[in-house]
Interface confidence: low
C-alpha cells in the first residue's frame, strides 16, 4: 500500500512593520512540534502595502482599511483557512508613529485604533497594534539576525550554513535605517554601558547577553533629508537652495509647511520670506557629507565615548549585520559585495552624484523618480552615519555586511518580535526532545 | 443549513437586566465573529455589538457601551448579550448576525427576539 | 462614524417594473457595502456584499453597482416577494452603519 504523506504540523504568524514611508507584512512559518528550536522559523511571504506610512492616514483614517485589504487578502490566500483562527497577527509601528505621537498623542491613537478595528475584520487572531518603542526595534532587529545566523545555537557547526556565519558565537551587531530613525544594537567587549537607557539585559537559550542599543530618533533617511533642507535653507540668499546632494540639472520645489512639518525640522525653523523654494541640484559628495555632519552635534559627550548628539555608544565590536535601507540604498548603487572597501565606497559615491540628472533618468528608467532623484543623498548619508555618526573606519569597515535576507527570511525587527511574543526564545537550552511551551516557565 | 435562534427577550422596567442568547447551528461557530443588531418599533437597523470568534475584540456602539457586554461560549455554539441599565428607547427587536471577514459580514440572521423596557 | 444616506425612503411601484434605490456613503468605504432585504415577518436576507457581488440563491432579477461614493441597488422587474424593506449596509469600518432604509409597496 501506497504511504499517504501526513498532513504538516505547521504553525503561521503575521507581523505588520508600519513604518513611516510604507507599511510591509510578513508571514511567518515554523514546524509547531520545533518552535523552541532556534532557527526554525522562516519567512514564507513579504507584502508590501501600497501608499505610504500609516501616520500620513491621520486625514483620511477611513481609507485605512482599504489600504490594508490587498495584503491581508494575500495572507489569508497563503495561509491555509483551517489555521486562520490560530494565525496571530501583531502590527508594530515605528519612527512614522512615534513621530505623529509626539506632536498628538490623540491623533496618533486615532490612526491606531481605526488600525485594529481594521485588522480585527479578518479571519486571523489579531493581538493589537502598538507603537513599539526606538529600544524594542533595534533589540528585535538584533534578535531576528542572530536567531537567523544560528548563533544562539549551542551546537557547532563543521559547514557553515548561511554567507556571514563563522563558527563562533559571537553574536552579530545590528544597524537598522529606516525613513524616520535609525537604530545601532550589538554586544560590547566587556565594556560597562554607561548609560542605563541604552542597556539591555537578555538571557536567550541558557546564555546571558549584555547588549547596547540606541535609536535616533529624526535620523532615518528620509527625516534626515529634511532636517538638513531646514538648515541649509536658513541660510540661502533667496528661494534658491543650490543642493550638494541632488545630481546636477535636478530641479524640485519643496513646500515650507511641508518642510516645518515634522518635528524633527523644529529646531531649525525660522520664518521664511517665501511659502516655497527650489532645489537646484550641483551633485557634490564632499560638500554633500560636509552638509550632512553639521546634522551631528559631536561637541559635548557627557561620557567616555559617544556617538553623537550626547548619546553613549561604546567601543565598536565584531560583525555588524546592515539591514532595512542601509542593504537597499547600497544595493541600488550596487555597493553591498564584502569586497567593495570603505575608500571605493566613498570613490563610487562621488562618481554617482556627480552624475548629471537626465543621465541618471536615462540610465535608472524603471526607477520612481521620486526614489532615484534621493540615492545620492541616501548613500552619503549612510556613509557619514557609519563613518562620522558610529565611528567606523576603513578597517572596521570590512565588519559591516550589508543584508537584504538571511536563509530567505528579511533581517529587520519583525521576526525577533514575533519570536518574543509568541514565546518562540526560550531563556534556558531546550532538552533534545522537543517539549511542549508549559516547560518553560 | 446555518440557523441562529434568538431568545430571552421579554418585558423589563427601566433599569433593569436581561440577557439575550442566540443559539448557532450548521456551521463553525468558532470560525466566526458575532454581531448583534436591532430594530426599534417602525425605525430602521442599528448595528448594537460585535465579538470576535476568539473574543479578543469587542465593540460597541457608542449608545450601549457600558451598559451592554457581548460575550460568547463557542463550546456550546452560544452568543449572548447581557443588558443592564436598561432604557426604553433599548426597546427593539434583537437580531443576531455572523460574520467571517468581508464575503460574509452578516450573511446570516436569526428571526429575532422581542426586547420591551416599559414601567 | 460613516452616515449612509438611503434613497428613497419609500417607494411604490408596479410588478415587472424597474427600480433603483441609492445609498450614499459620508466617507470613503472602497466598495465594502451589502444590500439587505426585510421581509414584513421580520425576516432578514443580505442579497448582495462588495457592492456588486450577488449572494447565492438570490435571483438575477437583483444587481449592485457602485458609482464613486454612490451606491445602487437594482430590481429590473418587480415581483411580488420583492416587496419589502431594503437596507443598505457599510462594512469598511466600526461602528458598522446601515442605512434608512426603503420600503418598496405595490402600487
Known amino acids: 500500500t501506497q504511504n499517504k504523506a501526513l498532513p504538516e504540523n505547521v504553525k503561521y504568524g503575521i507581523v505588520l512593520d508600519a513604518g513611516s514611508s510604507h507599511t510591509s507584512l510578513y508571514i511567518y512559518k515554523w514546524p509547531a512540534e520545533k518552535e523552541n528550536d532556534t532557527g526554525v522559523v522562516h519567512q514564507v511571504e513579504e507584502c508590501r502595502v501600497k501608499g505610504p506610512g500609516i501616520s500620513k492616514f491621520v486625514q483620511k483614517v477611513n481609507e485605512i482599511g482599504i489600504y490594508l485589504t490587498d495584503c491581508m487578502e494575500r495572507a489569508r490566500e497563503v495561509i491555509p483557512r483551517s489555521q486562520h483562527q490560530e494565525t496571530p497577527v501583531y502590527l508594530g509601528a515605528t519612527a512614522g508613529m512615534r513621530l505623529l505621537r509626539m506632536e498628538s498623542e490623540e491623533l496618533a491613537d486615532r490612526v491606531l485604533d481605526v488600525v485594529e478595528r481594521s485588522l480585527s475584520n479578518y479571519p486571523f487572531d489579531f493581538q493589537g497594534a502598538r507603537i513599539i518603542t526606538g529600544q524594542e526595534e533595534g533589540a528585535y532587529g538584533w534578535i531576528t539576525i542572530n536567531y537567523l545566523l544560528g548563533k544562539f545555537s549551542q551546537k557547532t557547526r563543521w559547514f557553515s550554513i548561511v554567507p556571514y556565519e563563522t563558527n563562533n558565537q559571537e553574536t552579530f551587531g545590528a544597524l537598522d535605517l529606516g525613513g524616520a530613525s535609525t537604530q545601532v544594537t550589538f554586544v560590547p567587549q566587556n565594556q560597562t554601558i554607561e548609560s542605563p537607557d541604552n542597556a539591555l539585559q537578555f538571557r536567550l537559550y541558557g546564555k546571558d547577553y549584555n547588549v547596547y542599543t540606541h535609536s535616533f530618533l529624526c535620523y532615518g533617511k528620509d527625516q534626515a533629508l529634511w532636517q538638513k533642507l531646514a538648515k541649509d535653507i536658513q541660510v540661502a540668499s533667496n528661494e534658491i537652495l543650490r543642493d550638494p546632494c541632488f545630481h546636477p540639472g535636478y530641479k524640485k520645489v519643496v513646500n515650507v509647511s511641508d518642510l516645518y512639518k515634522t518635528p524633527c525640522t523644529k529646531r531649525f525653523e525660522m520664518t521664511l520670506p517665501f511659502q516655497q523654494f527650489e532645489i537646484q541640484g550641483i551633485g557634490n559628495y564632499q560638500q554633500c557629507h560636509q552638509s550632512i555632519l553639521e546634522l551631528f552635534n559631536t561637541s559635548y559627550c557627557p561620557y567616555s565615548q559617544c556617538a553623537f548628539n550626547g548619546i553613549f555608544l561604546p567601543p565598536l565590536q565584531g560583525d555588524f549585520g546592515a539591514f532595512s535601507a542601509f542593504y537597499f540604498v547600497m544595493k541600488f548603487l550596487n555597493l553591498t559585495s564584502e569586497k567593495v572597501s570603505q575608500e571605493k565606497v566613498t570613490e563610487m559615491m562621488k562618481k554617482f552624484c556627480a552624475q548629471p540628472w537626465e543621465e541618471i533618468k536615462t540610465s535608472y528608467a524603471g526607477v520612481k523618480e521620486k526614489y532615484l532623484s534621493e540615492y545620492c543623498f541616501s548613500g552619503t548619508y549612510i556613509l557619514s552615519l557609519l563613518l562620522q555618526g558610529y565611528h567606523f573606519t576603513a578597517d572596521s569597515w570590512e565588519h559591516i555586511h550589508f543584508i537584504g535576507k538571511i536563509q530567505g527570511s528579511d533581517a529587520g525587527w519583525t521576526l525577533g518580535y514575533m519570536l518574543n511574543l509568541t514565546n518562540m526564545i526560550p531563556a534556558e537550552q531546550p532538552l533534545s526532545t522537543p517539549l511542549s511551551h508549559s516547560t518553560y516557565v | 443549513e446555518v440557523q441562529l435562534v434568538e431568545s430571552g427577550g421579554g418585558l423589563v422596567k427601566p433599569g433593569g437586566s436581561l440577557k439575550l442568547s442566540c443559539a448557532a447551528s450548521?456551521?463553525?461557530?468558532?470560525?466566526?465573529?458575532m454581531h448583534w443588531v436591532r430594530q426599534a418599533p417602525e425605525k430602521g437597523l442599528e448595528w448594537v455589538a460585535y465579538i470576535s470568534s476568539g473574543s479578543s475584540v469587542i465593540y460597541y456602539v457608542d449608545t450601549v457601551k457600558g451598559r451592554f457586554t457581548i460575550s460568547r461560549d463557542n463550546a456550546k455554539n452560544t452568543l449572548f448579550l447581557q443588558m443592564t441599565s436598561l432604557r426604553s428607547e433599548d426597546t427593539a427587536m434583537y437580531y443576531c448576525?455572523?460574520?467571517?471577514?468581508?464575503?460574509?459580514?452578516?450573511?446570516?440572521w436569526g428571526q429575532g427576539t422581542t426586547l420591551t423596557v416599559s414601567s | 462614524d460613516i452616515q449612509m444616506t438611503q434613497s428613497p425612503s419609500s417607494l411604490s411601484a408596479s410588478l415587472g417594473e424597474r427600480v433603483s434605490l441609492t445609498c450614499r456613503a459620508s466617507q470613503e468605504i472602497g466598495g465594502y457595502l451589502s444590500w439587505l432585504q426585510q421581509k414584513p415577518d421580520g425576516t432578514i436576507k443580505r442579497l448582495i456584499y462588495?457592492?456588486?457581488t450577488l449572494d447565492s440563491g438570490v435571483p438575477k432579477r437583483f444587481s449592485g453597482s457602485r458609482s464613486g461614493s454612490d451606491y445602487s441597488l437594482t430590481i429590473s422587474s418587480l415581483e411580488s416577494e420583492d416587496f419589502a424593506d431594503y437596507y443598505c449596509?457599510?462594512?469598511?469600518?466600526?461602528?458598522?452603519?446601515f442605512g434608512g432604509g426603503t420600503k418598496l409597496e405595490i402600487k
Open positions: 462588495a457592492a456588486s
Open positions: 448576525a455572523r460574520d467571517l471577514y468581508y464575503d460574509h459580514v452578516l450573511d446570516s
Open positions: 449596509l457599510q462594512y469598511a469600518s466600526y461602528p458598522r452603519t
Open positions: 450548521g456551521f463553525t461557530f468558532s470560525d466566526y465573529g
